[in-house]
């Protein structure tokens, strides 16, 4: 007798846990932005505080009734959804409304810029506990609320938002597309994209994780003791706030990174149907539903790492697209992918005091994306090393020479254009452990790192057969911080992280007219942190 | 995540001396116009002007009242609904498109942007 | 079968805390489609809805007697309790414990009180 | 709160005749309301839930229709064991009860 959403996202191991802790006395307060709210619903009464924040635009239409009940529907489900007594994901957290959506569900962008300075005030007058706000809502992309979240999500506030009910790309709308916010899709009962009508949940490489948005049970704003289900991405953000709420509410301490580390970390992974997507946007996409995760006292010393991808480069002969990690972050590797296969490669270089990871479109490509490979590594210390290209028919070498550094990923940047340079199969016989080896013409990028019980090895899985991919995993205990398609492949697209899964692709064409000896390899750099341990590379 | 997606950015042409005005002339705007994509989100008529991150309280106020005075001088009245100050240093204002050029070269300016709606998901 | 069956002392003394348990029988109180609540009727007057709880023991109560109400519950008795502090001679009623729906499974049925016990008459006196 | 008021206080029927109860609320209750019966030195017992909908086990006679602040309970034919207190009560805010109509044989 549980709701198929609370079965979903909460581990059984929770559940009993949250039968002890009826109302928890939790210090977290969540700011929902939304509709007005029925505060004496049963659900929430006692837990909601209505602030006299009202910045809404006006009804539209002559006719049209405002009726409280109907006025107070969608922000009263998503309090429901936060913090309910009985259906909610955080039950007993303190939540705050803040009235951006007047009775239509519409708002604007100054009213929510308006409502986080509020929250930012109230933080200021008032320092309380961790602030989690949610963001039921959604618009066009909007480069100062995507600011504005930046600058909140500074102060330490955790900012969720809804990936938008559009069936497009997340990217294309705001505070969705924000790199500080938490942005959750919608799936249904069934772990699959939710369809609304001739929409849907949104995609893309601006969502963090899905989460149960269709068919929700929650508190109603027809009376007192009501429950409508409602669906939606602003139902599957808030499944994510409520379980933000909870991680916090246990460890108080835990950033805006470690948050998003641990949420992607134990989500429940590969279980959506990608072809819901387009598919130029399903490897951009998540494949993961949000499932509360245990404490740091229960699975500490993990390495946690995330893919991020970058914004597609455009055509043009010289694009570059850029990938950057959250501050708290270290990049440790960077790879590129290009549907056409024409790319010039990836390299990761500093601007503004931060490493991002960089990749560049050839001549005659469609375009390229960065892929950064971005973790959480308490007290690192990682620099990059690089060497110019080699001479024709000569490899480039790169290794960590620091001491008790250790080599977490390498990338590749062709200066030459002719990309028939770099089919001649390269000699990797030579091939040190803890080296990167470079194809031929191209400069060489290694990422070495130094933390306390860091250390790192090398796994290779190649196919000389026909094959669109070639894949290596790190197995259990490791985490993948670099993946490559290491040299002497014939044309691939690159090389990218799903999850601990590196994968290297390859061109279409070139698997007709590629010699069986000469192997696509997937190269993938795993490494564990063991605190106890000094830095090290496995052989 | 944070390129501009599929956004409207517009430079507008600006006359290089308005109204004969050396202090207005003095400053020549680098500062963009933004709004969004989608035509029937757009508010026109109102507008967030964004300031540089640097720009201090007083000179928040201060460009804002220097909008009034030179909108005031040209025959517009314009409305400063709110004040930002801290989250980002800017303001709201209600005022009529052809002002945007001007404002666009108020010193401490970094962007406009549009006022647009947003929906509940 | 559900039943329910109040028990607590009959009288009860002005400015004294009126203490009542409901026993649960036939089916576990826990359960995220129920609450469990206490309803009162004075003599030949109507019916008052006094407060709910679930079996986490989340709470609700009536607010004109919120300041003085408290029940609670225990999972591994399958009971819940009822106390009212400061009775005056208005308490004096017959108090009846009731099932309620959550409204949280749709399928445990309508949003409204049934099994009801089959009541407690206390009368405040001195 | 939201105040129920019942009427008639007492409805003197014979068996076979149709009894018809009213309640009316001090403001909309939408729909959320429900009908009791309670015979004596028993508890009550839900007939009509949700305005119109008979709960499980009631007999067709019983009917219940409204929306809003005004409601009738029906009772088609009297039958004796239906002589009893009928209590009207909403759910849209908390929960309150009506005053009471009782149905006593003529």
């Known amino acids: 007798s549980i709701p198929w959403n609370l079965e979903r996202i909460i581990p059984a191991w929770h559940q009993t846990e949250e039968d002890r802790s009826p109302d928890g006395s939790s210090q977290v307060e969540v700011y929902l932005l939304d509709t007005s709210i029925q505060g004496a619903h049963r659900e929430i009464e006692g837990r909601v505080t209505i602030t006299d924040f009202n910045s809404v635009p006006e009804e539209d239409g002559t006719r049209f009734h405002r009726q409280a009940s109907k006025c107070d529907s969608h922000g009263t489900h998503l309090a429901g959804v936060v913090s309910g007594r009985d259906a909610g994901v955080a039950k007993g957290t303190s939540l705050h409304s803040l009235r951006v959506l007047n009775c239509q569900g519409k708002g604007t962008v100054s009213g929510t810029l308006i409502g986080l300075e509020f929250i930012r005030k109230s933080q200021l007058i008032q320092p309380s506990g961790p602030l989690v706000v949610l963001l039921p809502l959604a618009g066009g992309y909007s480069r100062i609320l995507n600011a504005a979240c930046r600058h909140l999500a500074r102060t330490g506030v955790v900012l969720v938002a809804a990936a938008g009910n559009f069936r497009d790309d997340a990217c294309l709308y705001s505070p969705a597309s924000a790199p500080e916010v938490i942005t959750v899709g919608a799936t249904n009962a069934q772990d699959q994209p939710v369809t609304l009508g001739t929409l849907g949940t949104n995609f893309g490489r601006c969502v963090d994780l899905f989460a149960p948005g269709k068919d929700i049970i929650g508190a109603s704003s027809d009376c007192s003791t009501c429950f409508m289900s409602q669906s939606g991405t602003s139902q599957a953000a808030a499944h994510v706030a409520g379980i933000v709420a909870r991680m916090l509410s246990r460890e108080p301490t835990l950033t805006l990174a470690e948050l998003r580390q641990r949420l992607i970390h134990f989500s429940t992974k590969d279980v959506i149907n990608m072809a819901w997507f387009p598919e130029d946007q399903q490897v951009l996409t998540p494949n993961l539903v949000a499932t509360l995760p245990p404490s740091t006292h229960e699975t500490g010393g993990q390495l946690l790492c995330r893919t991020v991808w970058s914004a597609h480069s455009g055509p043009t002969r010289t694009a570059t697209a850029t990938a950057r990690c959250a501050p708290e972050e270290e990049l440790l590797s960077c790879s590129s992918f290009s549907r056409s296969g024409r790319r010039r490669g990836d390299w990761i270089e500093a601007i503004g005091g931060q490493q991002v990871c960089k990749a560049l479109n050839a001549f005659g490509g469609e375009g390229v994306y960065a892929v950064a490979r971005c973790c959480l590594v308490p007290r690192a210390n990682c620099s990059i090393h690089n060497t110019p290209a080699a001479r024709a028919g000569l490899e480039t070498h790169v290794h960590c020479h620091q001491k008790d550094h250790v080599l977490t990923g390498c990338s590749f940047h062709w200066e030459v254009e002719d990309l028939s340079v770099r089919r001649q199969p390269a000699l990797r016989s030579r091939r040190q452990p803890g080296q990167c080896v470079g194809h031929q013409a191209a400069s060489v990028y290694a990422s070495c790192c130094h933390a306390p019980g860091l250390e790192c090895k090398i796994k290779e899985h190649g196919i000389s057969g026909p094959s669109e991919q070639v894949t290596v995993a790190c197995e259990a205990g490791w985490t993948l911080t670099g993946c490559n398609v290491l040299p002497g492949a014939s044309l691939t697209l690159g090389a990218y992280s799903v999850d601990n899964l590196c994968v290297a692709r390859v061109h279409d064409t070139a698997r007709a007219d590629r010699t069986s000896g000469e192997a696509t390899v997937a190269a993938a750099i795993c490494c564990r942190s063991r605190p106890s341990a000094k830095a090290s590379w496995v052989q | 995540q944070d390129e501009d997606g599929d956004y409207e950015e517009l430079m507008l042409a600006l006359p290089s001396q308005e109204d004969g005005l050396a202090d207005e002339a003095a400053h020549v705007a680098t500062a963009t116009f933004r709004r969004c994509s989608k035509e029937a989100w757009r508010l026109p008529g109102t507008y967030i002007v964004v300031l540089m991150e640097e720009t201090q309280r007083l000179q928040i106020e201060q460009t804002a009242h220097r909008l009034q005075t030179r909108a005031a001088r040209r025959g517009y009245v314009i409305k400063v609904l709110h004040i930002f100050y801290d989250l980002f240093p800017g303001f709201l204002v209600k005022m009529s498109s052809d002002l945007l050029g001007l404002a666009l070269k108020l010193p401490h300016v970094e962007y406009i942007e549009e006022d647009s709606f947003v929906f509940a998901q | 079968q559900l039943q329910l069956q109040e028990s607590g002392p009959g009288l009860v003394k002005p400015s004294e805390t009126l203490s009542l348990t409901c026993t649960v029988s036939g089916g576990s109180i826990r359960s995220s489609a129920y609450y469990w609540g206490w309803i009162r009727q004075p003599p030949g007057k109507g019916l008052e809805w006094i407060g709910s709880?679930?079996?986490?023991?989340?709470?609700y109560y009536n607010p004109s007697l919120k300041s003085r109400v408290t029940i609670s519950v225990d999972t591994s008795k399958n009971q819940f309790s009822l106390k009212l502090s400061s009775v005056t001679a208005a308490d004096t009623a017959v108090y009846y414990c009731a099932r309620e729906n959550s409204g949280v499974v749709p399928a445990a049925g309508p949003n409204w009180f049934g099994p009801w016990g089959q009541g407690t008459l206390v009368t405040v006196s001195s | 709160e939201i105040v129920l008021t019942q009427s008639p206080a007492t409805l003197s029927l014979s068996p076979g005749e149709r009894a018809t109860l009213s309640c009316r609320a001090s403001?909309?209750?939408?729909?959320?309301l429900a009908w009791y019966q309670q015979k004596p030195g028993q508890a009550p017992r839900l007939l009509i839930y949700?305005?119109?909908n008979r709960a499980t086990g009631i007999p067709a006679r019983f009917s219940g229709s409204g929306s809003g602040t005004d409601f009738t309970l029906t009772i088609s034919s009297l039958e004796p064991e239906d002589f009893a207190v009928y209590y009207c009560?909403?759910?849209?805010?908390?929960?309150?009860f009506g005053g009471g109509t009782k149905v006593e044989i003529k």
């Open positions: 949700d305005a119109s």
């Open positions: 403001q909309s209750v939408s729909s959320y």
């Open positions: 709880i679930n079996y986490r023991g989340s709470t």
């Open positions: 009560q909403q759910r849209r805010n908390w929960f309150t």
